[in-house]
Interface confidence: medium
Amino acid sequence: SERCDDWGLDTMRQIQVFEDEPARIKCPLFEHFLKFNYSTAHSAGLTLIWYWTRQDRDLEEPINFRLPENRISKEKDVLWFRPTLLNDTGNYTCMLRNTTYCSKVAFPLEVVQKDSCFNSPMKLPVHKLYIEYGIQRITCPNVDGYFPSSVKPTITWYMGCYKIQNFNNVIPEGMNLSFLIALISNNGNYTCVVTYPENGRTFHLTRTLTVKVVGSPKNAVPPVIHSPNDHVVYEKEPGEELLIPCTVYFSFLMDSRNEVWWTIDGKKPDDITIDVTINESISHSRTEDETRTQILSIKKVTSEDLKRSYVCHARSAKGEVAKAAKVKQKVPAPRYTVELACGFGAT
Protein backbone atom coordinates (compact mmCIF):
# COMPACT_ATOMS: atom_id res chain seq x y z
CA SER A 1 0.00 0.00 0.00
CA GLU A 2 1.11 3.58 -0.65
CA ARG A 3 2.73 5.70 2.06
CA CYS A 4 0.27 7.26 4.51
CA ASP A 5 0.82 10.51 6.40
CA ASP A 6 0.50 9.18 9.93
CA TRP A 7 -0.18 11.84 12.56
CA GLY A 8 0.27 9.23 15.26
CA LEU A 9 -1.77 8.93 18.46
CA ASP A 10 -3.33 12.28 19.30
CA THR A 11 -3.23 12.08 23.11
CA MET A 12 -4.22 15.75 23.35
CA ARG A 13 -7.70 14.58 22.47
CA GLN A 14 -8.21 12.04 25.24
CA ILE A 15 -11.92 11.47 24.69
CA GLN A 16 -13.96 10.24 27.62
CA VAL A 17 -17.59 9.15 27.29
CA PHE A 18 -20.03 7.57 29.72
CA GLU A 19 -21.03 3.93 29.43
CA ASP A 20 -24.51 3.24 28.04
CA GLU A 21 -24.88 6.73 26.58
CA PRO A 22 -24.76 7.97 22.99
CA ALA A 23 -21.43 9.37 21.82
CA ARG A 24 -20.58 11.20 18.61
CA ILE A 25 -16.90 11.56 17.84
CA LYS A 26 -15.65 13.67 14.97
CA CYS A 27 -12.56 12.55 13.10
CA PRO A 28 -9.81 14.89 14.36
CA LEU A 29 -8.14 15.06 10.92
CA PHE A 30 -10.48 17.79 9.74
CA GLU A 31 -10.45 19.72 12.99
CA HIS A 32 -6.76 19.85 13.77
CA PHE A 33 -4.52 18.37 11.07
CA LEU A 34 -5.82 19.07 7.56
CA LYS A 35 -6.60 22.41 5.95
CA PHE A 36 -9.80 21.21 4.29
CA ASN A 37 -13.10 19.91 5.66
CA TYR A 38 -14.90 16.61 5.14
CA SER A 39 -17.22 17.94 2.43
CA THR A 40 -14.28 19.10 0.35
CA ALA A 41 -12.50 15.78 0.85
CA HIS A 42 -15.64 13.82 -0.06
CA SER A 43 -16.19 15.93 -3.20
CA ALA A 44 -12.57 15.22 -4.21
CA GLY A 45 -13.27 11.49 -4.07
CA LEU A 46 -11.53 10.77 -0.77
CA THR A 47 -12.93 8.05 1.46
CA LEU A 48 -12.96 8.10 5.27
CA ILE A 49 -12.16 4.74 6.85
CA TRP A 50 -12.43 3.91 10.54
CA TYR A 51 -10.70 1.15 12.50
CA TRP A 52 -9.63 0.57 16.08
CA THR A 53 -7.30 -1.19 18.49
CA ARG A 54 -8.94 -2.68 21.56
CA GLN A 55 -7.62 -1.84 25.00
CA ASP A 56 -4.52 -3.92 25.86
CA ARG A 57 -4.24 -5.25 22.28
CA ASP A 58 -1.87 -4.42 19.43
CA LEU A 59 -4.00 -5.64 16.56
CA GLU A 60 -5.78 -3.01 14.46
CA GLU A 61 -9.20 -4.25 13.39
CA PRO A 62 -12.10 -2.82 11.44
CA ILE A 63 -15.03 -1.38 13.36
CA ASN A 64 -18.11 -3.57 13.12
CA PHE A 65 -20.84 -1.35 11.65
CA ARG A 66 -23.28 -4.30 11.39
CA LEU A 67 -24.20 -4.56 15.08
CA PRO A 68 -27.86 -4.89 16.12
CA GLU A 69 -29.78 -1.58 16.04
CA ASN A 70 -26.78 0.03 14.32
CA ARG A 71 -25.11 0.48 17.72
CA ILE A 72 -22.00 1.84 15.99
CA SER A 73 -22.39 3.83 12.80
CA LYS A 74 -20.61 6.45 10.73
CA GLU A 75 -22.18 9.60 9.36
CA LYS A 76 -19.92 11.84 7.29
CA ASP A 77 -16.89 12.52 9.55
CA VAL A 78 -18.62 11.39 12.76
CA LEU A 79 -18.40 8.02 14.46
CA TRP A 80 -21.61 7.29 16.41
CA PHE A 81 -22.21 4.99 19.36
CA ARG A 82 -25.87 4.44 20.26
CA PRO A 83 -24.99 3.71 23.03
CA THR A 84 -21.43 2.98 24.18
CA LEU A 85 -20.34 -0.18 25.97
CA LEU A 86 -17.47 -0.47 28.42
CA ASN A 87 -15.44 -2.61 26.05
CA ASP A 88 -15.54 0.07 23.34
CA THR A 89 -12.52 1.57 25.12
CA GLY A 90 -9.47 1.65 22.84
CA ASN A 91 -7.54 3.66 20.26
CA TYR A 92 -9.58 4.68 17.24
CA THR A 93 -8.09 5.63 13.87
CA CYS A 94 -9.70 7.58 11.05
CA MET A 95 -7.97 7.40 7.69
CA LEU A 96 -8.69 9.59 4.69
CA ARG A 97 -7.54 8.10 1.40
CA ASN A 98 -7.84 7.52 -2.32
CA THR A 99 -5.41 5.94 -4.75
CA THR A 100 -2.90 8.81 -4.54
CA TYR A 101 -3.43 10.31 -1.09
CA CYS A 102 -3.54 8.99 2.47
CA SER A 103 -3.65 10.66 5.88
CA LYS A 104 -4.57 9.15 9.24
CA VAL A 105 -4.68 9.92 12.94
CA ALA A 106 -5.44 7.82 16.01
CA PHE A 107 -7.02 8.98 19.24
CA PRO A 108 -7.83 7.30 22.56
CA LEU A 109 -11.44 6.74 23.55
CA GLU A 110 -12.22 5.80 27.14
CA VAL A 111 -15.67 4.57 28.12
CA VAL A 112 -16.19 5.52 31.76
CA GLN A 113 -18.60 4.22 34.40
CA LYS A 114 -20.44 6.59 36.73
CA ASP A 115 -22.25 5.97 39.98
CA SER A 116 -25.76 7.10 40.91
CA CYS A 117 -24.36 10.45 42.08
CA PHE A 118 -22.51 11.01 38.78
CA ASN A 119 -19.09 10.39 40.34
CA SER A 120 -16.61 8.99 37.83
CA PRO A 121 -12.97 9.20 36.68
CA MET A 122 -14.12 11.69 34.02
CA LYS A 123 -11.99 14.85 33.84
CA LEU A 124 -14.37 17.72 34.51
CA PRO A 125 -14.30 21.12 32.83
CA VAL A 126 -14.18 24.04 35.28
CA HIS A 127 -16.49 27.01 34.88
CA LYS A 128 -15.64 30.11 36.90
CA LEU A 129 -18.39 32.39 38.17
CA TYR A 130 -17.78 35.82 39.64
CA ILE A 131 -18.97 36.26 43.21
CA GLU A 132 -22.00 38.55 43.61
CA TYR A 133 -21.87 39.70 39.99
CA GLY A 134 -25.48 39.57 38.90
CA ILE A 135 -27.07 36.77 36.89
CA GLN A 136 -24.58 34.31 35.37
CA ARG A 137 -25.31 31.12 33.46
CA ILE A 138 -23.72 27.81 32.74
CA THR A 139 -24.84 25.78 29.73
CA CYS A 140 -25.08 22.02 29.47
CA PRO A 141 -21.95 21.31 27.40
CA ASN A 142 -21.32 19.08 24.35
CA VAL A 143 -24.89 18.16 23.48
CA ASP A 144 -25.02 19.75 20.02
CA GLY A 145 -25.66 17.36 17.14
CA TYR A 146 -27.19 14.57 19.19
CA PHE A 147 -30.80 15.26 18.19
CA PRO A 148 -32.53 17.52 15.65
CA SER A 149 -33.95 20.89 16.69
CA SER A 150 -37.45 19.46 16.25
CA VAL A 151 -36.84 17.14 19.22
CA LYS A 152 -37.52 18.73 22.60
CA PRO A 153 -35.44 16.93 25.23
CA THR A 154 -36.04 17.01 28.98
CA ILE A 155 -33.17 18.41 31.01
CA THR A 156 -32.65 17.80 34.72
CA TRP A 157 -29.95 19.61 36.67
CA TYR A 158 -28.21 18.27 39.78
CA MET A 159 -25.75 19.67 42.27
CA GLY A 160 -23.76 16.69 43.43
CA CYS A 161 -26.43 14.07 44.04
CA TYR A 162 -29.27 16.54 44.56
CA LYS A 163 -31.80 17.58 41.97
CA ILE A 164 -31.83 21.35 41.75
CA GLN A 165 -35.25 22.57 42.80
CA ASN A 166 -36.14 25.32 45.27
CA PHE A 167 -32.52 26.41 45.57
CA ASN A 168 -32.26 29.96 46.89
CA ASN A 169 -30.22 31.40 44.04
CA VAL A 170 -29.89 28.68 41.37
CA ILE A 171 -32.60 28.23 38.74
CA PRO A 172 -32.71 25.56 36.02
CA GLU A 173 -33.80 27.03 32.68
CA GLY A 174 -33.66 24.20 30.16
CA MET A 175 -30.11 23.79 28.85
CA ASN A 176 -29.00 26.69 31.06
CA LEU A 177 -28.54 26.89 34.80
CA SER A 178 -28.84 30.44 36.10
CA PHE A 179 -27.08 31.72 39.20
CA LEU A 180 -28.97 34.80 40.36
CA ILE A 181 -26.06 35.85 42.53
CA ALA A 182 -23.13 33.48 42.79
CA LEU A 183 -21.91 32.65 46.29
CA ILE A 184 -19.05 30.51 47.53
CA SER A 185 -21.58 27.88 48.58
CA ASN A 186 -22.33 27.43 44.87
CA ASN A 187 -18.91 25.79 44.43
CA GLY A 188 -19.29 22.18 43.40
CA ASN A 189 -20.08 19.75 40.62
CA TYR A 190 -23.18 20.37 38.52
CA THR A 191 -24.67 17.73 36.25
CA CYS A 192 -27.22 18.07 33.49
CA VAL A 193 -28.99 14.95 32.31
CA VAL A 194 -30.50 15.38 28.84
CA THR A 195 -33.13 12.79 27.89
CA TYR A 196 -34.33 12.50 24.29
CA PRO A 197 -36.17 9.95 22.10
CA GLU A 198 -34.78 8.48 18.92
CA ASN A 199 -36.34 5.75 16.77
CA GLY A 200 -38.51 4.47 19.62
CA ARG A 201 -35.65 4.40 22.09
CA THR A 202 -34.81 6.79 24.91
CA PHE A 203 -31.25 8.04 25.34
CA HIS A 204 -29.60 9.95 28.18
CA LEU A 205 -26.66 12.34 27.95
CA THR A 206 -24.89 13.12 31.23
CA ARG A 207 -22.60 16.13 31.42
CA THR A 208 -20.86 17.23 34.62
CA LEU A 209 -18.85 20.38 35.18
CA THR A 210 -17.23 21.99 38.17
CA VAL A 211 -18.30 25.48 39.21
CA LYS A 212 -15.74 27.59 41.05
CA VAL A 213 -16.83 30.95 42.43
CA VAL A 214 -14.04 33.50 42.12
CA GLY A 215 -13.40 37.13 42.99
CA SER A 216 -15.37 39.64 40.99
CA PRO A 217 -13.59 42.03 38.61
CA LYS A 218 -15.57 44.89 40.16
CA ASN A 219 -13.73 44.24 43.45
CA ALA A 220 -10.32 43.73 41.86
CA VAL A 221 -7.48 45.99 42.95
CA PRO A 222 -3.82 46.32 41.96
CA PRO A 223 -1.41 44.10 43.91
CA VAL A 224 -1.11 45.03 47.60
CA ILE A 225 2.30 44.60 49.23
CA HIS A 226 1.79 43.75 52.91
CA SER A 227 5.49 43.18 53.56
CA PRO A 228 7.98 44.81 53.45
CA ASN A 229 6.40 47.86 55.05
CA ASP A 230 7.36 51.00 56.92
CA HIS A 231 6.78 49.45 60.35
CA VAL A 232 9.49 46.79 60.16
CA VAL A 233 13.21 47.50 60.07
CA TYR A 234 15.58 44.62 59.27
CA GLU A 235 18.47 45.44 61.57
CA LYS A 236 21.35 42.96 61.35
CA GLU A 237 24.99 42.60 62.31
CA PRO A 238 27.47 41.35 59.70
CA GLY A 239 27.59 37.55 59.73
CA GLU A 240 23.92 37.16 60.68
CA GLU A 241 21.27 35.77 58.35
CA LEU A 242 19.09 38.35 56.62
CA LEU A 243 15.53 37.17 55.89
CA ILE A 244 13.08 39.58 54.25
CA PRO A 245 9.61 38.37 53.29
CA CYS A 246 7.79 39.97 50.40
CA THR A 247 4.09 39.19 50.87
CA VAL A 248 1.72 40.33 48.14
CA TYR A 249 -2.05 40.03 47.83
CA PHE A 250 -3.49 39.68 44.32
CA SER A 251 -7.20 40.02 43.56
CA PHE A 252 -8.49 37.20 41.37
CA LEU A 253 -8.37 38.25 37.73
CA MET A 254 -9.29 35.83 34.96
CA ASP A 255 -6.19 34.87 32.95
CA SER A 256 -3.96 37.36 34.79
CA ARG A 257 -0.33 36.45 35.37
CA ASN A 258 0.66 37.38 38.92
CA GLU A 259 4.35 38.11 39.38
CA VAL A 260 6.50 38.90 42.41
CA TRP A 261 10.22 39.58 42.25
CA TRP A 262 13.01 41.17 44.23
CA THR A 263 15.62 43.62 43.03
CA ILE A 264 18.86 44.32 44.85
CA ASP A 265 20.36 47.68 43.94
CA GLY A 266 18.03 47.69 40.94
CA LYS A 267 19.16 44.29 39.63
CA LYS A 268 17.51 40.89 39.66
CA PRO A 269 19.17 38.56 42.26
CA ASP A 270 20.42 36.31 39.43
CA ASP A 271 22.41 39.23 38.02
CA ILE A 272 24.27 39.97 41.24
CA THR A 273 27.26 38.22 42.78
CA ILE A 274 26.03 37.90 46.37
CA ASP A 275 24.75 34.53 47.57
CA VAL A 276 20.98 35.10 47.71
CA THR A 277 18.25 32.47 47.86
CA ILE A 278 14.60 33.17 47.25
CA ASN A 279 11.81 30.80 48.35
CA GLU A 280 8.25 31.29 47.18
CA SER A 281 4.98 30.07 48.66
CA ILE A 282 1.48 30.66 47.32
CA SER A 283 -1.87 30.47 49.11
CA HIS A 284 -5.37 31.09 47.83
CA SER A 285 -8.53 32.49 49.36
CA ARG A 286 -11.94 30.90 48.97
CA THR A 287 -12.49 33.09 45.90
CA GLU A 288 -9.04 32.37 44.41
CA ASP A 289 -7.49 35.66 45.42
CA GLU A 290 -3.81 34.84 45.72
CA THR A 291 -1.20 35.66 48.33
CA ARG A 292 2.38 35.15 47.19
CA THR A 293 5.29 35.27 49.62
CA GLN A 294 8.86 35.41 48.41
CA ILE A 295 11.45 35.24 51.18
CA LEU A 296 14.80 36.74 50.29
CA SER A 297 17.59 35.12 52.28
CA ILE A 298 21.28 35.97 52.65
CA LYS A 299 22.92 33.40 54.94
CA LYS A 300 25.82 35.55 56.15
CA VAL A 301 25.17 39.17 55.46
CA THR A 302 28.10 41.58 55.04
CA SER A 303 28.21 45.25 55.95
CA GLU A 304 28.17 45.95 52.20
CA ASP A 305 24.96 43.91 51.82
CA LEU A 306 23.36 45.96 54.60
CA LYS A 307 23.89 49.14 52.57
CA ARG A 308 22.10 47.77 49.50
CA SER A 309 18.58 48.61 48.36
CA TYR A 310 16.16 45.66 48.58
CA VAL A 311 12.93 46.27 46.69
CA CYS A 312 9.95 43.94 46.35
CA HIS A 313 8.01 44.27 43.09
CA ALA A 314 4.61 42.91 42.12
CA ARG A 315 2.62 42.95 38.91
CA SER A 316 -0.80 41.76 37.75
CA ALA A 317 -3.16 42.78 34.97
CA LYS A 318 -4.35 45.53 37.35
CA GLY A 319 -0.99 47.23 37.71
CA GLU A 320 2.51 47.18 39.11
CA VAL A 321 3.73 48.17 42.60
CA ALA A 322 7.02 48.16 44.48
CA LYS A 323 8.13 48.58 48.09
CA ALA A 324 11.63 48.90 49.55
CA ALA A 325 12.59 47.03 52.71
CA LYS A 326 14.19 49.04 55.52
CA VAL A 327 17.56 47.36 56.05
CA LYS A 328 20.27 48.73 58.32
CA GLN A 329 23.36 47.64 60.18
CA LYS A 330 22.89 47.12 63.89
CA VAL A 331 25.05 49.50 65.90
CA PRO A 332 27.09 47.36 68.33
CA ALA A 333 26.48 48.06 72.04
CA PRO A 334 29.36 50.03 73.68
CA ARG A 335 31.97 47.98 75.60
CA TYR A 336 31.71 49.98 78.79
CA THR A 337 35.17 49.49 80.34
CA VAL A 338 37.09 50.80 77.35
CA GLU A 339 34.67 53.13 75.56
CA LEU A 340 33.20 54.88 78.59
CA ALA A 341 36.64 55.24 80.16
CA CYS A 342 37.87 56.92 77.00
CA GLY A 343 34.83 59.16 77.14
CA PHE A 344 35.93 60.34 80.65
CA GLY A 345 39.39 61.20 79.43
CA ALA A 346 41.19 58.19 80.92
CA THR A 347 44.12 56.72 79.01
Epitope: I131, G160, G188, H226, Y249
Partner: antibody
Protein backbone atom coordinates in the same frame (compact mmCIF):
# COMPACT_ATOMS: atom_id res chain seq x y z
CA UNK B 1 -36.06 30.48 64.74
CA UNK B 2 -33.20 28.17 63.79
CA UNK B 3 -31.79 26.08 66.63
CA UNK B 4 -28.81 23.72 66.86
CA UNK B 5 -28.41 21.08 69.55
CA UNK B 6 -25.28 18.99 70.12
CA UNK B 7 -25.64 15.51 71.56
CA UNK B 8 -23.15 12.83 72.50
CA UNK B 9 -21.15 11.45 75.43
CA UNK B 10 -19.47 13.86 77.84
CA UNK B 11 -16.66 11.42 78.65
CA UNK B 12 -14.44 9.58 76.18
CA UNK B 13 -11.48 7.33 76.95
CA UNK B 14 -8.04 8.09 75.45
CA UNK B 15 -7.40 6.46 72.04
CA UNK B 16 -11.16 6.04 71.46
CA UNK B 17 -13.35 7.93 68.99
CA UNK B 18 -15.33 11.00 70.00
CA UNK B 19 -18.75 11.09 68.30
CA UNK B 20 -21.14 14.03 68.39
CA UNK B 21 -24.31 14.81 66.49
CA UNK B 22 -25.87 18.20 65.82
CA UNK B 23 -29.61 18.32 65.23
CA UNK B 24 -30.94 21.32 63.33
CA UNK B 25 -34.51 22.49 63.97
CA UNK B 26 -36.46 25.48 62.68
CA UNK B 27 -34.81 25.29 59.26
CA UNK B 28 -33.56 22.90 56.60
CA UNK B 29 -30.03 21.55 56.62
CA UNK B 30 -30.37 21.36 52.81
CA UNK B 31 -30.47 25.13 52.31
CA UNK B 32 -28.18 26.01 49.43
CA UNK B 33 -26.46 28.94 51.15
CA UNK B 34 -25.52 27.28 54.45
CA UNK B 35 -22.47 25.37 55.56
CA UNK B 36 -22.51 23.50 58.88
CA UNK B 37 -19.43 23.62 61.06
CA UNK B 38 -17.83 22.22 64.20
CA UNK B 39 -15.75 24.45 66.47
CA UNK B 40 -14.13 23.54 69.78
CA UNK B 41 -12.84 25.45 72.78
CA UNK B 42 -10.53 23.85 75.36
CA UNK B 43 -11.27 25.03 78.93
CA UNK B 44 -10.04 28.60 79.42
CA UNK B 45 -8.69 28.81 75.85
CA UNK B 46 -9.70 30.21 72.46
CA UNK B 47 -11.80 28.87 69.61
CA UNK B 48 -10.55 26.33 67.03
CA UNK B 49 -12.38 25.50 63.81
CA UNK B 50 -12.55 21.73 63.22
CA UNK B 51 -14.33 21.54 59.87
CA UNK B 52 -17.43 22.31 57.84
CA UNK B 53 -19.84 20.37 55.64
CA UNK B 54 -22.30 21.32 52.90
CA UNK B 55 -25.60 19.50 52.53
CA UNK B 56 -24.29 17.69 49.44
CA UNK B 57 -21.65 16.08 51.67
CA UNK B 58 -18.60 18.07 50.56
CA UNK B 59 -16.29 18.80 53.50
CA UNK B 60 -13.41 21.03 54.51
CA UNK B 61 -11.24 20.15 57.50
CA UNK B 62 -8.62 21.87 59.59
CA UNK B 63 -5.30 20.36 58.38
CA UNK B 64 -4.14 20.03 62.01
CA UNK B 65 -6.96 17.52 62.62
CA UNK B 66 -7.62 16.19 59.12
CA UNK B 67 -6.11 12.73 59.68
CA UNK B 68 -8.42 12.11 62.65
CA UNK B 69 -11.64 13.93 61.77
CA UNK B 70 -14.71 12.99 59.76
CA UNK B 71 -17.87 15.07 59.34
CA UNK B 72 -21.01 13.65 57.74
CA UNK B 73 -24.52 14.87 57.03
CA UNK B 74 -27.92 13.15 57.14
CA UNK B 75 -30.39 15.41 55.34
CA UNK B 76 -33.34 13.09 56.09
CA UNK B 77 -32.80 13.60 59.83
CA UNK B 78 -31.67 17.24 59.51
CA UNK B 79 -28.46 16.31 61.34
CA UNK B 80 -24.72 16.47 60.86
CA UNK B 81 -22.12 14.57 62.85
CA UNK B 82 -18.52 14.76 63.98
CA UNK B 83 -16.15 11.86 64.58
CA UNK B 84 -12.69 12.47 66.03
CA UNK B 85 -10.53 9.37 66.37
CA UNK B 86 -7.56 8.51 68.62
CA UNK B 87 -8.42 11.19 71.18
CA UNK B 88 -6.05 12.37 73.90
CA UNK B 89 -6.43 14.70 76.88
CA UNK B 90 -5.59 17.58 74.51
CA UNK B 91 -8.96 17.00 72.80
CA UNK B 92 -10.84 17.87 76.00
CA UNK B 93 -12.99 20.86 75.05
CA UNK B 94 -16.45 22.28 74.64
CA UNK B 95 -17.55 21.25 71.14
CA UNK B 96 -19.92 23.61 69.34
CA UNK B 97 -21.87 23.04 66.16
CA UNK B 98 -22.75 26.12 64.15
CA UNK B 99 -24.37 27.29 60.94
CA UNK B 100 -22.12 29.17 58.55
CA UNK B 101 -24.18 31.56 56.43
CA UNK B 102 -23.10 32.58 52.95
CA UNK B 103 -26.19 34.47 51.85
CA UNK B 104 -24.30 37.77 51.95
CA UNK B 105 -21.26 36.44 50.08
CA UNK B 106 -19.27 36.74 53.33
CA UNK B 107 -19.32 33.75 55.64
CA UNK B 108 -19.91 33.92 59.35
CA UNK B 109 -21.16 31.56 62.04
CA UNK B 110 -24.49 33.20 62.83
CA UNK B 111 -26.17 30.38 64.80
CA UNK B 112 -24.46 28.20 67.40
CA UNK B 113 -25.42 25.25 69.53
CA UNK B 114 -25.09 25.64 73.31
CA UNK B 115 -21.94 23.47 73.32
CA UNK B 116 -21.12 20.00 74.61
CA UNK B 117 -18.25 19.55 77.06
CA UNK B 118 -16.29 16.42 76.17
CA UNK B 119 -13.67 15.24 78.64
CA UNK B 120 -11.03 12.75 77.54
CA UNK B 121 -10.02 10.67 80.55
CA UNK B 122 -9.60 7.05 81.51
CA UNK C 1 -2.50 29.22 57.74
CA UNK C 2 -3.58 32.80 58.37
CA UNK C 3 -2.76 33.92 61.91
CA UNK C 4 -4.93 36.52 63.62
CA UNK C 5 -3.35 38.55 66.40
CA UNK C 6 -5.75 40.36 68.71
CA UNK C 7 -4.71 43.22 70.93
CA UNK C 8 -4.98 43.84 73.75
CA UNK C 9 -5.52 40.41 75.33
CA UNK C 10 -7.10 42.04 78.41
CA UNK C 11 -8.81 45.36 78.71
CA UNK C 12 -10.19 47.05 81.85
CA UNK C 13 -12.84 49.65 81.17
CA UNK C 14 -15.78 51.40 82.78
CA UNK C 15 -19.40 51.68 81.69
CA UNK C 16 -19.70 54.47 79.13
CA UNK C 17 -16.10 54.10 77.89
CA UNK C 18 -15.24 53.88 74.22
CA UNK C 19 -13.44 50.59 73.64
CA UNK C 20 -11.34 49.60 70.62
CA UNK C 21 -10.04 46.10 69.90
CA UNK C 22 -7.61 45.41 67.07
CA UNK C 23 -7.21 42.28 64.98
CA UNK C 24 -4.19 41.91 62.69
CA UNK C 25 -4.04 39.21 59.99
CA UNK C 26 -0.75 37.63 58.93
CA UNK C 27 -1.75 38.17 55.29
CA UNK C 28 -4.40 40.10 53.40
CA UNK C 29 -7.96 38.81 53.85
CA UNK C 30 -9.90 41.57 52.07
CA UNK C 31 -13.07 42.06 54.16
CA UNK C 32 -13.51 38.39 55.08
CA UNK C 33 -13.54 38.96 58.84
CA UNK C 34 -16.17 38.43 61.54
CA UNK C 35 -16.34 39.48 65.21
CA UNK C 36 -17.94 37.44 68.01
CA UNK C 37 -18.81 38.09 71.64
CA UNK C 38 -18.64 35.27 74.18
CA UNK C 39 -19.81 35.28 77.76
CA UNK C 40 -18.71 32.63 80.30
CA UNK C 41 -20.46 29.29 79.79
CA UNK C 42 -22.20 30.49 76.62
CA UNK C 43 -21.67 29.99 72.91
CA UNK C 44 -20.13 32.84 70.90
CA UNK C 45 -22.55 35.34 69.37
CA UNK C 46 -22.00 36.94 65.97
CA UNK C 47 -21.66 40.74 66.13
CA UNK C 48 -20.18 41.77 62.79
CA UNK C 49 -19.48 40.06 59.46
CA UNK C 50 -17.79 41.27 56.27
CA UNK C 51 -15.51 43.37 58.55
CA UNK C 52 -18.07 46.13 59.04
CA UNK C 53 -21.63 44.82 58.58
CA UNK C 54 -23.66 44.71 61.79
CA UNK C 55 -25.50 41.45 62.36
CA UNK C 56 -29.26 41.83 62.70
CA UNK C 57 -30.31 42.48 66.33
CA UNK C 58 -26.87 43.67 67.47
CA UNK C 59 -26.88 47.13 69.10
CA UNK C 60 -25.52 49.97 66.96
CA UNK C 61 -22.87 50.85 69.58
CA UNK C 62 -20.86 48.01 68.04
CA UNK C 63 -19.03 48.81 64.82
CA UNK C 64 -16.29 47.24 62.75
CA UNK C 65 -13.81 48.66 60.29
CA UNK C 66 -10.74 47.72 58.31
CA UNK C 67 -9.70 45.73 55.27
CA UNK C 68 -6.67 43.74 54.22
CA UNK C 69 -4.67 43.02 57.36
CA UNK C 70 -5.83 45.57 59.97
CA UNK C 71 -9.28 45.39 61.55
CA UNK C 72 -10.96 47.13 64.47
CA UNK C 73 -13.99 46.43 66.64
CA UNK C 74 -15.28 49.50 68.43
CA UNK C 75 -17.84 49.73 71.25
CA UNK C 76 -18.81 53.40 71.32
CA UNK C 77 -20.23 53.40 74.86
CA UNK C 78 -19.60 50.30 76.94
CA UNK C 79 -22.67 48.85 78.66
CA UNK C 80 -22.75 46.44 81.63
CA UNK C 81 -23.82 43.56 79.36
CA UNK C 82 -20.78 44.12 77.09
CA UNK C 83 -18.26 42.74 79.60
CA UNK C 84 -17.20 39.55 77.78
CA UNK C 85 -14.49 38.05 75.58
CA UNK C 86 -14.35 39.15 71.93
CA UNK C 87 -12.93 37.07 69.07
CA UNK C 88 -12.16 37.92 65.47
CA UNK C 89 -12.36 35.20 62.82
CA UNK C 90 -11.09 35.13 59.23
CA UNK C 91 -13.26 33.39 56.66
CA UNK C 92 -11.03 34.24 53.71
CA UNK C 93 -9.32 30.87 53.35
CA UNK C 94 -9.09 27.42 54.87
CA UNK C 95 -8.38 26.62 57.61
CA UNK C 96 -10.73 29.15 59.17
CA UNK C 97 -8.94 30.72 62.13
CA UNK C 98 -9.85 32.78 65.18
CA UNK C 99 -7.90 35.43 67.05
CA UNK C 100 -6.73 34.66 70.58
CA UNK C 101 -9.49 36.75 72.13
CA UNK C 102 -9.75 40.01 74.07
CA UNK C 103 -11.28 39.90 77.53
CA UNK C 104 -13.08 43.11 78.47
CA UNK C 105 -13.30 43.42 82.26
CA UNK C 106 -14.88 45.96 84.62
CA UNK C 107 -12.37 48.49 85.91
Amino acid sequence: QLQLQESGPGLVKPSETLSLTCTVSGGSISSSTYYWGWIRQPPGKGLEWIGSIYFTGSTDYNPSLKSRVSISVDTSKNQFSLKLSSVTAADTAVYYCAKEDDSSGYYSFDYWGQGNLVTVSS
Amino acid sequence: DIQLTQSPSFLSASVGDRVTITCRASQGISSYLAWYQQKPGKAPKLLIYAASTLQSGVPSRFSGSGSGTEFTLTISSLQPEDFATYYCQQVNSYPLTFGGGTKVEIK
